[in-house]
Interface confidence: low
Amino acid sequence: VPRWRQQWSGPGTTKRFPETVLARCVKYTEIHPEMRHVDCQSVWDAFKGAFISKHPCNITEEDYQPLMKLGTQTVPCNKILLWSRIKDLAHQFTQVQRDMFTLEDTLLGYLADDLTWCGEFNTSKINYQSCPDWRKDCSNNPVSVFWKTVSRRFAEAACDVVHVMLNGSRSKIFDKNSTFGSVEVHNLQPEKVQTLEAWVIHGGREDSRDLCQDPTIKELESIISKRNIQFSCKNIYRPDKFLQCVKNPEDSSCTSEI
């Protein structure tokens, strides 16, 4: 008789999840000299230990502490780029602007980017059929708690001027319920962070509106100002040109507004 299995609302663990995490870890440590000391098998064991045999709606930040310890990494605190709902452009940017970092440019962010995972209470199995959905099932699921934990730590590490890339095509350019809005904004340290600079990325080529005046951006400014952090905002009207000018700042067309 097949054993009853909890059916969750979200997609199951990514296929070949253990192999993917291990392979990504090996690749990352090969590319990043300062992380060559990391033992990827230990990283996988700590990752697995955070959710295997545990109820996937009862995961805590403490469960991830062994993994956090193994993945401890120093990034230049004044070169942090946060993003919300515009991951691809943020990653293209840091590929070109080599000394800036998104969370996914760190070991732990790189390991988990775009992956889903969960286990089952009291069994050592990984659930490849379904995992809890944040809204429909529970918020304390393995994936959500992981990103909340690493995002908090990443924001806490930031200093000086912190940049955030926001999607100007969305109805809520700043969304209080996003990871940026619910975790990162509240964990920037006012004693270390002088300014949060938002880059609002425009979607349409003919869109010349000042999206820095959007009500949700004003809401972000209010939240940040109340935390004694300065706020500034820039419209990026031409994301394609923006990237090109990051690659080639000497280009004559890059002196005009982008």
Epitope: K27, E30, I31, H32, P33, E34, P76, K79, Q95, R98, D99, F101, D105, K247, N248, P249, E250
Partner: antibody, heavy 119, light 106 residues
Framework: QVQLVQSGAEVKKPGASVKVSCKAS????????MNWVRQAPGQRLEWMGY????????EYNQKFKDRVTITRDTSASTAYMELSSLRSEDTAVYYC????????????WGQGTTVTVSS | QIVLTQSPATLSLSPGERATLTCSAS?????MYWYQQKPGQAPRPWIY???NLASGVPARFSGSGSGTSYTLTISSLEPEDFAVYYC?????????FGQGTKVEIK
């Protein structure tokens, strides 16, 4: 272990072109950018450009933009640097150097290829 | 382009002495990188992101600085430290190097 092995010394006449190769081994070629740097006798190091092997994206020092072309053959794990319209001041040792792209130094360098431009 | 000027051009010191090499940038840069080069050899990475020692570099080396002024310090010179040191910046294309400081035996 990581190795970058460059092609042998070249003697060229002014106006000619030279193509230097750099064969990588001991690591995944597409995971690292490949830079080209030259050093004229008694002079400082001079960065010429790089290629991202995984995407074929190149970026050049404007000084060489019209004369230098950096290419790669991923199947052979080899990068190439071609410099055209050679002049005597291009006489230098040319190095390839791999770069991990996240704020680090160029960590492994080829042995260097001496290019002499003389009539 | 950003011009990097190293001083002094030559530093004549004895083993055991402290060496201070400076690199001045014509415009502010985010970080400085340093390479060591010995005669007939390719440069070797020495310091990255201003203050991080590359793999295998002894702890007697240190790097510091910000903006337009950066320093490489050798607390107590060993015979193998005598070489040319180049600073380099990645902040603005073209990536540029200093003219080098030669640390020679007095």
């Amino acid at each position: 272990q990581v190795q970058l092995v460059q092609s042998g010394a070249e003697v060229k006449k002014p106006g000619a072109s030279v193509k230097v190769s750099c064969k990588a081994s001991g690591y995944t070629f597409t995971n690292y950018w490949m830079n080209w740097v030259r050093q004229a006798p008694g002079q400082r190091l001079e960065w010429m450009g790089y290629i991202i092997p995984s995407t074929d994206y190149t970026e050049y020092n404007q000084k060489f933009k019209d004369r230098v072309t950096i290419t790669r053959d991923t199947s052979a794990s080899t990068a190439y640097m071609e410099l055209s319209s050679l002049r005597s001041e291009d006489t230098a040792v040319y190095y390839c150097a791999r770069y991990p792209y996240r704020g680090y130094a160029m960590d492994y360098w080829g042995q260097g290829t001496t290019v002499t431009v003389s009539s | 382009q950003i011009v990097l000027t190293q001083s002094p051009a030559t530093l004549s010191l004895s083993p055991g002495e402290r060496a201070t090499l400076t690199c001045s940038a014509s415009s502010s840069v985010s970080y400085m990188y340093w390479y060591q080069q010995k005669p007939g050899q390719a440069p070797r990475p020495w310091i990255y992101l201003t203050s991080n020692l590359a793999s295998g570099v002894p702890a007697r080396f240190s790097g510091s600085g910000s903006g337009t002024s950066y320093t490489l310090t050798i607390s107590s010179l060993e015979p193998e430290d005598f070489a040319v040191y180049y600073c380099q910046q990645w902040s603005t294309n073209p990536w540029t190097f200093g003219q080098g400081t030669k640390v020679e035996i007095k």
